[in-house]
Interface confidence: medium
Amino acid sequence: QNSQLQEELRGLRETFSNFTASTEAQVKGLSTQGGNVGRKMKSLESQLEKQQKDLSEDHSSLLLHVKQFVSDLRSLSCQMAALQGNGSERTCCPVNWVEHERSCYWFSRSGKAWADADNYCRLEDAHLVVVTSWEEQKFVQHHIGPVNTWMGLHDQNGPWKWVDGTDYETGFKNWRPEQPDDWYGHGLGGGEDCAHFTDDGRWNDDVCQRPYRWVCETELDKASQEPPLL
Amino acid sequence: QNSQLQEELRGLRETFSNFTASTEAQVKGLSTQGGNVGRKMKSLESQLEKQQKDLSEDHSSLLLHVKQFVSDLRSLSCQMAALQGNGSERTCCPVNWVEHERSCYWFSRSGKAWADADNYCRLEDAHLVVVTSWEEQKFVQHHIGPVNTWMGLHDQNGPWKWVDGTDYETGFKNWRPEQPDDWYGHGLGGGEDCAHFTDDGRWNDDVCQRPYRWVCETELDKASQEPPLL
Amino acid sequence: QNSQLQEELRGLRETFSNFTASTEAQVKGLSTQGGNVGRKMKSLESQLEKQQKDLSEDHSSLLLHVKQFVSDLRSLSCQMAALQGNGSERTCCPVNWVEHERSCYWFSRSGKAWADADNYCRLEDAHLVVVTSWEEQKFVQHHIGPVNTWMGLHDQNGPWKWVDGTDYETGFKNWRPEQPDDWYGHGLGGGEDCAHFTDDGRWNDDVCQRPYRWVCETELDKASQEPPLL
């Protein structure tokens, strides 16, 4: 009977050994497969993320164009209506003027003394630019670049005054440190009575005779946003 | 020999016990890993679905804009050609007019007596609107809203007549019940000789002096859909 | 003791049998689950690939439109500025003219005798087309199709001459075989003094009175591509 037990025990050991080997192989296989799937999953995930990012960037860039078209088309249509219509109110800016926040701006490319620049704008039914907010400051700055440029602010008759009557005291200001200083050291006679944007956009007072560039501004009529009666 | 068998059996039991424990742990680990992968897969799938849906919506919305631009640009180009060209045929509507079924419509925002409205349209090489179908009725109604508005229909010289010569008897009609009634009870002298859209779109005859809004219509020439010879 | 060993052996065999069965079931389950995940993963991957492809195609198609708008809008704006401005230089083509290599072309849809066609172009500050290269020949041919069409070449005063003074002898030519032949056999009086594109694009001389289509050409001024200063 002992020999029979030994036989059974040997058989059991062998079966167990085979099962152990096959189970370990299967588990190892599953583990490898799981690892591959995991890696594949990670790669798929980052692929999805990249695709999402790329498409999103493409879409945003396209959207910017499309938004620009909406604005360009509106502006062109308005100019076309102005050409065709007889409305006395201007609801869009002339060609080569830039519309921003219901005002039209014209940026010179040559230089003039402040009084000349002021006169130029007045003859256009416009005025030298009046800066009323940080937002408008940034807009103008973006268009003029780092170039000395006259604005509609002066103190030729005493206190600082905006050309369109906007209150200076309570309004927006963006002077350079220690400006305005009404400096007399330039040797050109008198002080400095006219304000201009400097190369970093902040303001300085200077001799009004300097031949700086300038910006004209005119407000779009508030009265009627309806299309003119044809 | 028994004791040796017992020893072998104990060893086998121990090996088996260890293998069982380690296999169960590995299988449990794999099972957990599989569950995680499954969940991750589900999340990835729904993420992909959401991204597909979002991008598809974005794209559709962008496509709508783009289709609108195609139409706007075509219209603007045509208007520009009309301004520049000397073609006697009009192939597109002026700015601020609405094109519909090869006609151009202009909707007033102020009021005039019927004769003044009629004259206004004539000065535009147009005529007061002539409604020839239920479809056109709905189009005009949609644009004027619930406001009394003159059309090109009157009986000032006897029978009801459309201003462009369209036959009244055989044509489309949309009178309110019991209208037209040529009512004399208003005390303004005479009856009611001019037709207008009422607040529900159906027609009524009224005193021609009333200062109602009006709609001008002009047909796009059928002769040539080609751009005019420049 | 033997019977005890047999008992233990039976118990171990049973435990082992149960464990084998349950392990095989679990491993089989994991294997199936792994296979499913793998298949799902493959499907997700190809879905992602398809989505990437579809969206990329949509985006490219949209981008083409948007690029076309950029160009259309630039052209319209330029035409608008030309309408509004007094710049003597033309920096863009009129509406309904086609720009190509810094020239503007207008393709007639009706027919005229050569002299009438020549006069038409002159009234447009243009001239009948002058073909100076194989590239320009292909461009014009593409636009006119297989239709007899006058060009700005004639020998009414003796030698062959281009209307804008371009030298005929040294310049581009594209005559049909055995043309020009100044044929008198047509019975219309005289020979053939005016050149036209034939149905395959090559040139032929014909009676100048024939009512053929024509092409006008005008050069965009090289002097200034800048928009006119307002």
Partner: antibody, heavy 121, light 108 residues
Framework: DVQLQESGPGLVKPSQSLSLTCTVT?????????WNWIRQFPGNKLEWMGY???????RYNPSLKSRISITRDTSKNQFFLQLNSVTTEDTATYYC??????????????WGQGTSVTVSS | DIQMTQSPASLSVFVGEIVTITCRAS??????LAWYQQKQGKSPQLLVY???NLADGVPSRFTGSGSGTQFSLKINSLQSEDFGNYYC??????????FGGGTKLEIK
């Protein structure tokens, strides 16, 4: 090319109104610039009378302010001069002209050919 | 109003000579001045804008100069087609934008 053409009666009686039309071709008067009336007296002295701008605003010579009116009809691309209560002193050649805006300054760059008006009873 | 004084009122010169016409403003007008030429029976033609800039198509023998209150128009090597009347006009401040009295340039 831009062209301006004046038209109107050559003879006006004293105390009546003088009305002239300037027709512009080649440019829309609503697009830009200022559209002016200028007159030249028999001794060749030139006088700027006033303008109407592209946006419809007007400016007049103060010496004429009580008598002058400049209007327009944009559908016909025309602008008009009306001078009331005329006397023999208003006998002159009347010109319309466009004031152009260069980057550096201004000038009347396009003129009509002028129309002669005599005030006489 | 700003007064514009032109001198001389007339001058008679030979073809090929140099001519200078001056214009004085009653107050500072910076560079806001235009010059015009007018031939007998024709309308004035713009020669110079902003004191120194030649209008399109104007020959280079014409030169504008000056700023503030003193301005001049110089014609080098006078040609027969240059004879006629010359006027200055200011574009400064509030209207009126007055003209000078004119200079009659005759052939000798």
């Amino acid at each position: 090319d831009v062209q301006l053409q004046e038209s109107g009666p050559g003879l006006v009686k004293p105390s009546q109104s003088l009305s002239l039309t300037c027709t512009v071709t080649g440019y829309s008067i609503t697009s830009d610039y200022a559209w002016n009336w200028i007159r030249q007296f028999p001794g060749n002295k030139l006088e700027w009378m006033g303008y109407i701008s592209y946006s419809g605003s007007t400016r007049y010579n103060p010496s004429l302010k009580s008598r002058i009116s400049i209007t327009r009809d944009t559908s016909k691309n025309q602008f008009f001069l009306q001078l009331n209560s005329v006397t023999t002193e208003d006998t002159a050649t009347y010109y319309c002209a466009r004031r152009y805006r260069y980057d550096e300054g201004y000038g009347m760059d396009y003129w009509g050919q002028g129309t002669s008006v005599t005030v006489s009873s | 109003d700003i007064q514009m004084t032109q001198s001389p009122a007339s001058l008679s010169v030979f073809v090929g000579e140099i001519v200078t016409i001056t214009c004085r403003a009653s107050e500072n007008i910076y560079s806001n001045l235009a010059w015009y030429q007018q031939k007998q029976g024709k309308s004035p033609q713009l020669l110079v804008y902003a004191a120194t800039n030649l209008a399109d198509g104007v020959p280079s023998r014409f030169t504008g100069s000056g700023s503030g209150t003193q301005f001049s128009l110089k014609i080098n090597s006078l040609q027969s087609e240059d004879f006629g009347n010359y006027y200055c006009q200011h574009f400064w401040g509030t209207p009126p934008w007055t003209f000078g009295g004119g200079t009659k340039l005759e052939i000798k």
